[in-house]
């Protein structure tokens, strides 16, 4: 807390300019009018203030706006944004995407800070849903943003926003998140033709059910092994050898290298060995010829 002292004669700041960097902490406190600072916030970012001086400027704004800063000030905070605590930011009402962009720019190229996380949370809650423009902006600054959301939060993403998602934005998503995103993507891309549809839906397929994988196998999509390895195990298990062969096309040969890894390993265990042999890949571990396979889950459902 800076002590209240009178401003020395002739030192009262008439504008926010570089002469202020020579002011001591107490002089900044005494000689800079908070209302002047608020109207000229955009100048602060071009002036080499020390961290200590930035603390004083923040203190002045806090006194002027105890209930939270207005958006006109927030938009021009620049470096000062990084001096804000999440508690400060929770008092704000940020509605403009331009304000959000301006503040994200301050932290560009760095991991999401607690300040940024709180800002985004406030912004998205204020909007009620993650619209396309917001998602576009957030994933541009933080490619992993989407995968940082809980399945519950992802449920508020409208299908139209899915068009903004790039494959790399889904790199760190887990199956629970893809379970939520996949139906939205399916809806968003439903009017596209086969090959174009597959290109768009491919990175969401970790949430696809068996029926959709069976349908894709009829469309000559040539799914790569990297995508196949990310599919849900429970969705892959019911696929026949013929369906997997059609689904992967020329990439089917890659199964051999992955035969010890899920979901390939578990899928092999469910197939008849003679069906696997038709692939000519030397895959081993299938059900020996002459064995009867009882689907106990089906039996339980019937009883």
């Amino acid at each position: 807390e800076v002590e209240k002292t009178a401003c020395p004669s002739g030192k009262k700041a008439r504008e926010i300019d570089e002469s202020l960097i020579f002011y001591k902490k107490w002089e900044l406190e005494a000689c800079v009018d908070a209302a002047l600072l608020a109207t000229q916030m955009d100048r602060v970012n071009a002036i080499p203030f020390t961290y200590e001086q930035l603390d004083v400027l923040k203190h002045k704004l806090d006194e002027l706006y105890p209930q939270g800063y207005p958006e006109s000030v927030i938009q021009h905070l620049g470096y000062l944004f990084l001096k804000m605590s999440p508690e400060d930011i929770r008092k704000w009402n940020v509605t403009s995407l331009e304000t959000l962009k301006a503040l994200l720019e301050v932290n560009k190229g760095h991991e999401m800070s607690p300040q940024v996380a709180t800002l985004i949370d406030r912004f998205v809650k204020g909007r009620g849903q993650l619209d396309k423009d917001t998602l576009d902006t957030l994933t541009a600054f933080y490619p992993g943003y989407l995968c940082s959301l809980s399945p519950e939060e992802l449920s508020s993403v409208p299908p139209s926003s899915i068009w903004a998602v790039r494959p790399q934005d889904l790199d760190t998503c887990d199956p629970r998140q893809l379970d939520v995103l996949y139906p939205k993507a399916r809806l968003a891309f439903q009017n596209m033709n086969g090959s174009e549809y597959f290109v768009k839906i491919q990175s969401f397929l970790g949430g696809a059910p068996t029926e959709d994988l069976k349908a894709l196998s009829q469309q000559n999509v040539s799914m790569d092994l990297a995508t196949f390895m990310k599919l849900r195990t429970d969705a892959v298990l019911p696929l026949t050898v013929a369906e997997v062969q059609k689904l992967l096309g020329p990439h089917v040969e890659g199964l051999k290298a992955e035969e010890r890894h899920r979901p390939v390993r578990d899928w092999i265990l469910r197939q008849r060995q003679d069906d696997l042999d038709t692939l000519g890949l030397g895959l081993q571990g299938g059900i020996p010829n002459g064995y009867l396979v009882l689907d106990l889950s089906m039996q339980e459902a019937l009883s």
């Epitope: 071009a46 002036i47 203030f49 020390t50 961290y51 200590e52 190229g109």
Partner: antibody, heavy 119, light 107 residues
Framework: QVQLVESGGGVVQPGRSLRLSCAAS????????MNWVRQAPGKGLEWVAV????????YYADSVKGRFTISRDNSKNTLYLQMNSLRAEDTAVYYC????????????WGQGTLVTVSS | DIQMTQSPSTLSASVGDRVTITCRAS??????LAWYQQKPGKAPKLLIY???SLESGVPSRFSGSGSGTEFTLTISNLQPDDFATFYC?????????FGQGTKVEIK
Amino acid sequence: QVQLVESGGGVVQPGRSLRLSCAASGFTFSSDAMNWVRQAPGKGLEWVAVIWNEGSNKYYADSVKGRFTISRDNSKNTLYLQMNSLRAEDTAVYYCARDRGPLWPLDYWGQGTLVTVSS
Amino acid sequence: DIQMTQSPSTLSASVGDRVTITCRASQSISRWLAWYQQKPGKAPKLLIYKASSLESGVPSRFSGSGSGTEFTLTISNLQPDDFATFYCQQYSSYSRTFGQGTKVEIK
């Protein structure tokens, strides 16, 4: 006068950890940001990390993200660099350096401490 | 990250010469550029900040200029003590990237 003294360097095997320290004196440590900069033998300077005066803002070079952690103890006037999963390419002299604001240069530097990562 | 490119990488000169080192930024950094001098086995020393401001105690034969993306360091009357490696560094972002260095050696 401002003084920065690094310590904690030495020889370490790849994959192991090391913690560097930088003892500061001659200025108000809690008012300024502190940086780590390194220099591989015969090479140029590479900025590694910065921590702001209050300790809550930390930024890292891509080459060390997720492996190195910068921290500070303002009550002890000491800066730290925790280095995990060390690689041969982390071999360098590590300098600590001060900056007084987001738009200030590195005005004071320590003498450096050598870290050698080798099996 | 902002890339900094220095040229030349090595410069041979004689005492009394005027030498110029250039530094180019991959994007505009306004005037937030510093120049450092480093001698073998020693820590870098700040010479110039904000592109053209001379650090206290640095001889006036050192000068800097430029803004945006193009910057120069000039030593107007090279002295025996000036043979060293010089680095530029941008500090307009928190990732304070350096140029690769220019070694000024005796011709």
